[in-house]
């Protein structure tokens, strides 16, 4: 890379001194190698997030499984390969366990608590709510450039949005990727949703001056508000039944 | 058939300034991203500019910033770039490009350009 | 970076396979064929490798790392010409051409 950088990821340390003068790029937080030729894992994007703090409806119902992330930021423990461990813990040593976008899905324990696996997000509804316009957007517009985005600056192949819904002001989009079905190139599905969810708030991760430009036939879409949703292959475990907003 | 027609070039004075336009057709040109590039007689071929599809982002070569502008006309389906200030190191043919990936995070990058013009030729001279 | 690391020249006999380098960037590339000064050049890949449909299924792209590549299997004779290869210059958050490639067919 030109001067060293990581264009993915503007949350790393990166040098020339690793073999042969090779620009390499590290999480920050984490110290751990990340590849900048695609998205970096959501879990080491949010420790280096919180290092740099130290320092018909045709809109679709959620599952009653469905889980929004109220719980916010925490710091999380990753693997060797960037992914979130299945159990985290804070400083007090209260615990949980997380499914693989790194979203608290059963109650907090103690130290105790045993995780055994970490359950993957297959299914991730994206909520968007825009800001009003002189005319309603044209759903078939809307599909083709939101499906656009995904596929050309996350690099998601198309296979894994599912369906775009809209149903003025709001607009749905489904995000589905079982285990099976990802390749070992393929971008996950979240850490699509974060680096989306980030791009949005106008904290974009990518190094580059060039923002989100999202726009239907001209119209740009300017969002309001958002709330993501995450469905796991297993249901969560919380000892209350509750769908949670957030 | 996608096409991509330049036209303003011819002999400019230095110091003056200029208006080349693009003329588009066979594509829907308010979905693209735009470049002008250029190439000095016998030299390679140098990046210019680019703009977004709703002219809200543009970016500019070190040799042209501060001289140059780039907008569109989506209604008109036309790219311009105004350049002043003009030098004798400004001659050469410039071309106007399509971008294939708008959204991309490198969407400046040369590597998306998927269609270009003919070129119309400057030449700054006294 | 003042321009993307390509070999000057690289010279084959018809029917060889060529393959021409391009560093440097930190984003896509794209190769840019020119047989004579002037006259605009033919994109023959575009984002890495995307090869455009009026262009023979010889030429192909790809990219390791940082590194992109054209190759040519079985290069004939109307192959020789210039290539440039063109990309993302991370440092200034632009675009940027190597300096080209003379691709002599012996």
């Known amino acids: 890379q030109s001067n060293c950088t990581c264009p993915t990821n503007k949350m790393t340390v990166c040098d020339t001194n690793g073999p042969g003068g090779v620009c390499q790029c590290r999480a920050m937080g984490s110290q751990v190698l990340v590849d900048c030729s695609t998205l970096t894992s959501k879990c080491l994007l949010l420790k280096a997030r919180m290092s740099a703090r130290k320092s018909g409806r045709s809109l679709v119902m959620p599952s009653e499984h469905a889980i929004l992330d109220n719980d916010g930021l925490y710091d999380p423990e990753c693997d060797d390969k960037g992914r979130f461990k299945a159990r985290q813990c804070n400083q007090t040593s209260v615990c949980w366990c997380v499914n693989s976008v790194g979203v608290r899905r059963t109650d907090k324990g103690d130290q105790s608590l045993r995780c055994d696996e970490v359950v993957r997000t297959h299914h991730i509804l994206i909520e968007l709510r825009h800001r009003p316009t002189d005319r309603a957007f044209n759903h078939s517009d809307l599909d083709s450039e939101l499906r656009r985005l995904f596929q050309e600056r996350y690099k998601l192949h198309p296979s894994f949005l599912s369906a775009v819904h809209y149903e003025e002001p709001t607009i749905q989009i489904e995000l589905r990727q079982n285990a099976s079905q990802k390749g070992l190139r393929d971008v996950d599905i979240a850490d699509a949703a974060y680096y989306f969810e980030r791009d949005i708030k106008g904290e974009s991760l990518f190094m580059g001056r060039r923002g989100l430009d999202v726009q239907v036939r001209g119209e740009p879409l300017h969002v309001e508000r958002t709330l993501i949703y995450y469905l796991d292959e297993k249901p969560p475990q919380f000892s209350m039944k509750r769908l949670t907003a957030g | 058939a996608v096409t991509l027609d330049e036209s303003g070039g011819g002999l400019q004075t230095p110091g003056g300034g200029l208006s080349l336009v693009c003329k588009a057709s066979?594509?829907?040109?308010?979905?693209?991203?735009m470049f002008w590039v250029r190439q000095a007689p016998g030299k390679g071929l140098e990046w210019v500019a680019v703009?977004?599809?709703?002219?809200?982002?543009?970016n500019y070569a070190p040799a042209v910033k501060g001289r140059a502008t780039i907008s569109r006309d989506n209604g008109q389906s036309t790219l311009r770039l105004q350049l002043n200030n003009l030098r004798a190191e400004d001659t050469g043919t410039y071309y106007c490009?399509?971008?294939?990936?708008?959204?991309?995070?490198?969407?400046?990058?040369?590597?998306?350009?998927?269609?270009w013009g003919h070129g119309t030729e400057v030449i700054v001279s006294s | 970076a003042l321009a993307l690391t390509q070999p000057s020249s690289v010279s084959a006999n018809p029917g060889e396979t060529v393959k021409i380098t391009c560093s440097g960037g930190?984003?896509?590339y794209g190769w840019f064929q020119q047989k004579s000064p002037g006259i605009a050049p033919v994109i023959v890949i575009?984002?890495?490798?995307n090869r455009p449909s009026d262009i023979p299924s010889r030429f192909s792209g790809s990219k390791s790392g940082s590194t992109g590549t054209l190759t040519i299997t079985g290069v004939q004779a109307e192959d020789e010409a210039v290539y440039f290869c063109?990309?993302?210059?991370?440092?200034?958050?632009?675009?940027?051409f190597g300096a080209g490639t003379t691709l002599t067919v012996l």
């Open positions: 490009a399509r971008g294939a990936c708008t959204h991309c995070w490198d969407a400046d990058s040369a590597g998306y350009i998927d269609t």
């Open positions: 066979g594509f829907d040109f308010i979905d693209y991203d």
């Open positions: 703009i977004n599809r709703s002219g809200s982002y543009t």
């Open positions: 930190s984003g896509s």
């Open positions: 575009f984002n890495d490798d």
């Open positions: 063109g990309g993302y210059d991370g440092s200034t958050d632009a675009g940027i």
